[in-house]
């Protein structure tokens, strides 16, 4: 059951070594702090991953989606689950790993010329004029006047990065573009193999900050080159 997954609420991560308080998240990947598991004092790497409760896909990382871990899914706690690779079953785009999308219940590669049109069709069909739902989710970020809070702050609607405050860039978030934080050292970044392929992303990441470049993480050994994790690293 889900309770056993969460082990009676004992999602006990070690205190953050890199901030986390005062509105700053800790370093995303590079520090990979140990995680303290309930009932034991073992430090374990981030690969033995602790369940992360979520309400929506956007709360999860780029390689995850939000769902109930039990088949059939009770209406209780949902957690971030690993994204589905190509040819795996899916119910919505967010379930598929980056570079893939959900078509006819299967994750397929987005490296296809017709993909962009298809995504835009899906968005148009789902939202019509009232921007109500996508993939069964309740109201998403909209372009209404409500979104224009302090100009250029995180989450503000933008057209280009110059619209955003320092330390933020303008990146795609569903069908709109919003100001998101420029990536810091160790954070996951997107390395585009094909020119223009960033147009396919529903959740676009910012670029790496000054003095950093997006490179394959050295210790990230995976079978296929294409699925290797890229992080922002010092030049």
């Amino acid at each position: 059951t889900l309770n056993s997954v969460l082990n009676s609420n004992a999602i006990k991560n070690l205190p953050p070594p890199l901030g986390g308080a005062a509105g700053h998240p800790g370093s995303a990947v590079s520090a990979a702090p140990g995680i303290l598991y309930p009932g034991g004092n073992k430090y374990q790497t981030i690969d033995n991953y602790q369940p992360y409760p979520c309400a929506e896909d956007e709360e999860c990382g780029t390689d995850e989606y939000c769902a109930s871990p039990t088949r059939g899914g009770d209406a209780g706690v949902q957690i971030c689950l690993a994204c589905r690779k190509r040819r795996k079953r899916c119910m919505r785009h967010a379930m598929c790993c980056p570079g893939n999308y959900c078509k006819n219940g299967i994750c397929v590669s987005s490296d296809q010329n017709h993909f962009r049109g298809e995504i835009e069709e899906t968005i148009t069909e789902s939202f019509g004029n009232d921007h109500s739902t996508l993939d069964g989710y309740s109201r998403r970020t909209t372009l209404s006047s409500k979104m224009y809070h302090t100009k250029g702050q995180e989450g503000s609607v933008c057209l280009r990065s110059s619209d955003c405050a320092s330390g933020l860039c303008c990146a795609r978030h569903f069908w709109s573009k919003i100001c998101k934080p420029v990536l810091k050292e160790g954070q996951v970044c997107t390395k585009h193999r094909r020119k223009g392929s960033h147009g396919l992303e529903i959740f676009q990441r910012c670029y790496c900050g000054e003095g950093l470049s997006c490179r394959i993480q050295k210790d990230h050994h995976q079978a296929s080159n294409s699925s290797r994790l890229h992080t922002c690293q010092r030049h």
Partner: nanobody
Framework: EVQLVESGGGLVEPGGSLRLSCAAS????????MKWVRQAPGKGLEWVSH????????MYADSVKGRFTISRDNAKNMLYLQMNSLKPEDTAVYFC?????????????????RGQGTQVTVSS
Amino acid sequence: EVQLVESGGGLVEPGGSLRLSCAASGFPFSIYPMKWVRQAPGKGLEWVSHITRDGGRTMYADSVKGRFTISRDNAKNMLYLQMNSLKPEDTAVYFCARSAGKVVSRASLENDYRGQGTQVTVSS
């Protein structure tokens, strides 16, 4: 800059109640699910409760279910946690938090944006 400021903590006897508040600023509050997490002395972060953007759905850890109630006021950019029937094991620093989301490859409580926290002590 994302800012979350918690208040409402204090010393309370077992069985007592407290209401925590969290004032959010620096981001469009209404488009983010929010949560409360806590950290007991010498322990790691522990998830307590979650609420969707519109407040329509809530989730609770087993240890607080039926005793705690999470709510939000999007017009005021405020998040709340009503804590009833408090127990000594609820003693902790309580943080209001928001996910870092798609900036990381895998989400973790450590990567969340959160405030400085408010101390809740349950003791007779």
